[in-house]
């Protein structure tokens, strides 16, 4: 026979905060540490599980086959109900009835997810967006793995990501002084560095790379670096290449310079030799399979160099160099020096001896070509 | 067990074809680049072609280029050399190898067969 | 097409002995090289890949430098067992190029 349950015998609700999918324990204690008769119900008095003698029945709720409880716990008291692979709809007071007691407990379940595909390029945007029940007012915090705090209700907008930005997300969602988190893995599709600038003496071999910020089981798509000499009046397609699977084919090269591309990743291009005509800046792209948009890195590369003719020794650099870099002459083991901030130094009837040219930003070379001066004799007068 | 073996070789005259298989069993097949590398009797190794897992992509040396062709049938397990217009300098071992994992290096390698070009 | 030059082609040594042999791109191949070892009749054998990683099962005494253009292996404590001819080969792109050799001869 059951005995009613009066309003002194029905304990202060418990709030307890779930995740969408997760599992949940909803705890319930009886005073004595032994087996006793216990029902979970929901708001609706719909019995979910309960003991019938030594057994877990369970109920007509719509729980019935997410729901269980931990019957190796009964004999301590303990009659939690577990609810596997939560929904938003699972949200509701859940009482448990145990020793014509009434324990309440109010489960909110949330959900935090990325409108679109967790693999975002580099300046595009990041909404996540949080699913709650009717009726609750959760607060949203997220932090991203550079350390930047962004906060918000429902929605939450990164408006511009940045490869920084690429990592674990960590996001906390609060309700009635509780909390629970989310970790969300974003993935910034970039290349590792914007820009880079290789600095080569005039006939050295260049190499420039292209690291990518982030690693993918299968990649492919398609690229292109685009060159912009500084001597040219426009820009020309250097090489086209596909990608596929992390493997590099090349479908089209440009005569001069000839170009070797590497066939696997990272992406890596040789340039047989440093000349004058090459010098400028060059913007490699990458389009991705699936991907709107294409990922970008500049490339520049200056070349240095060193001449005599006749009386005049000159050191002429080309290519994007920027206005604080100090260009220098300077005889081995001697202070003659001639430094400037320009494109070109030159020493009119130089020494003779072993010279450096120098490309010099604040102090530290960037690029050094050595220059033999020999010894010129007047020529003898002729009788 | 990871294995590859060789068949196909033998005697030609020059300017004749010949085809070699290579059987492969205990990897995915379609998920390496292979090779034929050839080995002249007393000299040192040559690279003669190659095909790309992913894409299928073919290569060749330009000893061999227009002459040669590489192949595969996945559904075999079997990886092909079609040699056509044969030469005296052709005459070789021919290994077949298997790439490793994001071309780790030839990380398996046939015991080879022989392909003798003379009239 | 890159060419690979291999150095020495032949060397005389004793066990015990540390070896080194090298090999220089024509051009910049990062580290995508292998080395490998091979004995009279049989097939090739990787020993190291991508310039300085051991293959699985290969002793440690075999190992790999370099970057770029230069590369070496080195045998630390020469075995019997080791005497043999090496090749180095670039996968850096096709067609790929062995060295010439190096014959490694028991004095």
């Known amino acids: 026979e059951q005995k009613l349950i009066s309003e002194e015998d029905l304990a202060a609700k418990k709030v307890v905060l779930g995740k969408k999918g997760d599992t949940v324990e909803l705890t319930c204690n009886a005073s004595q540490k032994k087996n006793t008769q216990f029902h979970w119900k929901n708001s609706n008095q719909i019995k979910i599980l309960g003991i019938q003698g030594l057994f877990l029945t369970k109920g007509p709720s719509k729980l019935s086959d997410r729901a269980d409880s931990r019957k190796s716990l009964w004999d301590q008291g303990c009659f939690s109900m577990i609810i596997k692979n939560l929904k938003i709809e699972d949200s509701d007071t859940y009482i448990c009835e145990v020793e014509n007691k009434k324990e309440e407990v109010e489960l909110l379940v949330f959900g935090l997810t990325a409108n679109s595909d967790t693999h975002l390029l580099e300046g595009q945007s990041l909404t996540l967006t949080l699913e709650s029940p009717p009726g609750s007012s959760p607060s949203v915090k997220c932090r991203s793995p550079g350390g930047k705090n962004i906060q918000g209700g429902r929605t939450i907008s990164v408006p511009q990501l940045e490869r920084q930005d690429s990592g674990t997300w960590t996001c906390t969602v609060s309700q009635d002084q509780k909390t629970v988190e989310f970790k969300i893995d974003i993935v910034v599709l970039a290349f590792q560095k914007a820009s880079s600038t290789v600095y080569k003496k005039e006939g050295e071999q260049v190499e420039f790379s292209f690291p990518l910020a982030f690693t993918l089981e299968k990649l492919t798509g398609s690229g292109e670096l685009w060159w912009q000499a500084e001597r040219a009046s426009s820009s020309k397609s250097w090489i086209t290449f596909d990608l596929k699977n992390k493997e590099v084919s090349v479908k089209r090269v440009t005569q001069d310079p000839k170009l070797q591309m590497g066939k696997k990743l990272p992406l890596h291009l040789t340039l047989p030799q440093a000349l004058p005509q090459y010098a400028g800046s060059g913007n490699l792209t990458l389009a991705l399979e699936a991907k709107t948009g294409k990922l970008h890195q500049e490339v520049n590369l200056v070349v240095m160099r060193a001449t005599q003719f006749q009386e005049n020794l000159t050191c002429e650099v080309w290519g994007p160099t920027s206005p604080k870099l100090t260009l220098s002459l300077k005889l081995e083991n001697k202070g003659a020096t001639v430094s400037k901030q320009a494109k070109a130094v030159w020493v009119l009837n130089p020494e003779a001896g072993m010279w450096q040219c120098l490309l010099s930003d604040s102090g530290q070379v960037l690029l050094e070509s050595n220059i033999k001066v020999v010894p010129t004799w007047p020529t003898p007068v002729q009788p | 067990e990871v294995q590859l073996l060789e068949s196909g070789g033998g005697l030609v005259q020059p300017g004749g074809s010949l085809r070699l298989s290579c059987a492969a069993s205990?990897?995915?097949?379609?998920?390496?680049?292979m090779s034929w590398v050839r080995q002249a009797p007393g000299k040192g190794l040559e690279w003669v072609s190659g095909i790309s897992g992913s894409v299928g992509s073919t290569y060749y040396a330009d000893s061999v280029k227009g002459r040669f062709t590489i192949s595969r049938d996945k559904s075999k397990n079997t990886l092909y050399l079609q040699m056509n217009s044969l030469r005296a300098e052709d005459t070789a071992v021919y290994y077949c190898a298997k790439e490793g994992y994001d071309w780790s290096g030839m990380d398996v390698w046939g015991k080879g067969t022989t392909v003798t070009v003379s009239s | 097409a890159i060419q690979m030059t291999q150095s020495p082609s032949s060397l005389s040594a004793f066990v015990g002995d540390r070896v080194t042999i090298t090999c220089r791109a024509s051009q910049g191949i990062r580290n995508d090289l292998g080395w490998y070892q091979q004995k009279p009749g049989k097939a090739p054998k990787l020993l190291i890949y991508?310039?300085?990683s051991l293959q699985s099962g290969v002793p440690s005494r075999f190992s790999g430098s370099g970057s770029g253009t230069d590369f070496t292996l080195t045998i630390s404590s020469l075995q019997p067992e080791d005497f043999a001819t090496y090749y180095c080969l670039q996968d850096y792109n096709y067609p790929y190029t062995f060295g010439q050799g190096t014959k490694l001869e028991i004095k």
């Open positions: 205990g990897f995915t097949f379609s998920s390496y680049a």
């Open positions: 991508a310039a300085s």
